[in-house]
Amino acid sequence: GHWGAWMPSSISAFEGTCVSIPCRFDFPDELRPAVVHGVWYFNSPYPKNYPPVVFKSRTQVVHESFQGRSRLLGDLGLRNCTLLLSNVSPELGGKYYFRGDLGGYNQYTFSEHSVLDIVNTPNIVVPPEVVAGTEVEVSCMVPDNCPELRPELSWLGHEGLGEPAVLGRLREDEGTWVQVSLLHFVPTREANGHRLGCQASFPNTTLQFEGYASMDVKYPPVIVEMNSSVEAIEGSHVSLLCGADSNPPPLLTWMRDGTVLREAVAESLLLELEEVTPAEDGVYACLAENAYGQDNRTVGLSVMYAPWKPTVNGTMVAVEGETVSILCSTQSNPDPILTIFKEKQILSTVIYESELQLELPAVSPEDDGEYWCVAENQYGQRATAFNLSVEFAPVLLLESHCAAARDTVQCLCVVKSNPEPSVAFELPSRNVTVNESEREFVYSERSGLVLTSILTLRGQAQAPPRVICTARNLYGAKSLELPFQGAHRLMWAKIGP
């Protein structure tokens, strides 16, 4: 043999009970002591430090803390140094060293020692991870190292968590003993934070010890708080709240169209939108995620705003007889009432639509002119004016005529035409044509689609000449002999050389 000792490195006992520290030791066989003596020291192995003597086989002298509380259960002659401590109190917690005394110079303090822990609560062992929906085993373990007092275990607050199974007394690796009771159950998310207790009682004594463990049940997120659809006026402040219940707290993410707007590990997350614009109208998603799962919900944000200025697309220049299609469109929320007016007359209207199509089949010159597209909802009104130009061949209007006054003759040629025509006055009798470019004789004035050209003739009195007015544009030409109103002497201007 050789010098060596075997005892548990740590051992526990309930306050007020006892503890048996199992201990064996060995020494070289050749020492052959007649009597083996031994000493148990408390907290220090160095005799020089005068550590409290827990037990000494040679004498009854022990430290006052251990008076009447220490006894050797083992037989030192059989190399068994098992120590019994009774009525243990917290101050007895610490290190216990054994010193073998074989006589002569052979006293040996073993470096192996036992650390006594005085406890007053059962140890509830919950697995490091408890997941909702997955069966779990919770154990209650208490030291059972006192041969005089055996603990009995019972569970507290386990109603609905299954029936406990008592495993009984189990030997641990280093020779210490524990009493174990098991509880098997499938936890729900509601069990999170539940206080589960275990009670150790000692029959025929008043000793009773309770320990509690709070269940830390892990479970996936469920979104429990979220706005219903939100309507907001453009420029206002909008708060979108998402709250989730999970353990551990989730990573909450606000997203829109795949873009992360805000995220945080929290139980609730507020998305603040300052001065909302129509561009922020849409579907917002809240995603809650932890290691155990995820949940997501969406909320629609509707940004209410007055119509934008309508845009008008289509043919703005048309030839008489063609069909004209004009599209007036806008954007607003809610959709507007769209109306197309011409000279205060409603031509077309739609309710709660964002575009209005105006069809004008076989346009005539009367369709030429200014039109208005008006968009309106409860938040405002916007209008856009547009002009439709109808092109047609000249039409000589009936008010065209010639009239004599003193020494002049004035001829009016009134033409309706689009585009503007060129006008010429022909005096067949003189074989003369006067164009509007000859400002000395011809004055032209246009009002809308009507062009009035006035030819002024000065000269001697003669018979009134025939005057033919010809109006021409790209769509055609029209001629009219201008009638005279009254037969007067005329003054003729000499035209030409």
Epitope: P28, L31, R32, P45, L102, G104, Y105, Q107, Y108, T109
Partner: antibody, heavy 126, light 112 residues
Framework: QVQLVQSGSELKKPGASVKVSCKAS????????MNWVRQAPGQGLEWMGW????????TYADDFTGRFVFSLDTSVSTAYLQISSLKAEDTAVYYC???????????????????WGQGTLVTVSS | DIVMTQSPDSLAVSLGERATINCKSS????????????LAWYQQKPGQPPKLLIY???TRESGVPDRFSGSGSGTDFTLTISSLQAEDVAVYYC????????FGQGTKLEIK
């Protein structure tokens, strides 16, 4: 040089007590253990036990427990043997003898007694 | 305890002659951890304390004449004085210091 000088002879009546001293010099007192050996008149040597001068811990041979006490005064490098309730059979020469000690960690190894005191005769007689 | 038995109890040897004293232990005094024999020999002259001659069964203490030698291992040991001198007259004790310390009963050496 190493010297162990013991106190002088003592004549005591039965039931009395006696305290024998052993003053060491010439070496470091606490590096050596101090043994006590008894030699009755015309008899052999009997080891009574020893005291660890470093820790102050005494060890008594099985026949010398109870009435025999080893003590120290390290300040004056002196070891003491006290015998109480003296009996006639305690009459003997009492020797102190040192032994080297090799310390390692919390333990030590003791070796042979190399230097002895001159002895103190204790006579117990009525 | 380990019992030490010396032989003979007394011995008379002529000056200059070899003297041999034997010592037998009831159990081995050889320590396995260091392979040393925990045995010593002492010389005690009348009115004097014992004097260490030999330790570890065969190691001579400083200052001891080389005519003294020790031998043996385990349980059987011998002290030899190769050439007896007049000043060697004394009682010789063997002593084990492995376990609880014990001495032999002593051997009285005289001049023949």
């Amino acid at each position: 040089q190493v010297q162990l000088v013991q106190s002088g002879s003592e004549l005591k009546k039965p039931g009395a007590s006696v305290k024998v001293s052993c003053k060491a010099s010439g070496y470091t007192f606490t590096n050596y253990g101090m043994n006590w050996v008894r030699q009755a008149p015309g008899q052999g040597l009997e080891w009574m036990g020893w005291i660890n001068t470093y820790t102050g811990e005494p060890t008594y041979a099985d026949d010398f427990t109870g009435r025999f006490v080893f003590s120290l005064d390290t300040s004056v490098s002196t070891a003491y043997l006290q015998i109480s309730s003296l009996k006639a059979e305690d009459t003997a020469v009492y020797y102190c003898a040192r032994n080297p000690i090799n310390y390692y960690g919390i333990n030590y190894e003791g070796y042979v007694m190399d230097y002895w005191g001159q002895g103190t005769l204790v006579t117990v007689s009525s | 305890d380990i019992v030490m038995t010396q032989s003979p109890d007394s011995l008379a040897v002529s000056l200059g002659e070899r003297a041999t004293i034997n010592c037998k232990s009831s159990h081995s005094v050889l320590y396995s951890s260091n392979q040393k024999n925990y045995l010593a020999w002492y010389q005690q002259k009348p009115g004097q304390p014992p004097k260490l001659l030999i330790y570890w069964a065969s190691t001579r203490e400083s200052g001891v004449p080389d005519r003294f030698s020790g031998s043996g291992s385990g349980t059987d040991f011998t002290l030899t004085i190769s050439s007896l001198q007049a000043e060697d007259v004394a009682v010789y004790y063997c002593h084990q210091y492995l376990s609880s310390l014990t001495f032999g009963q002593g051997t009285k050496l005289e001049i023949k």
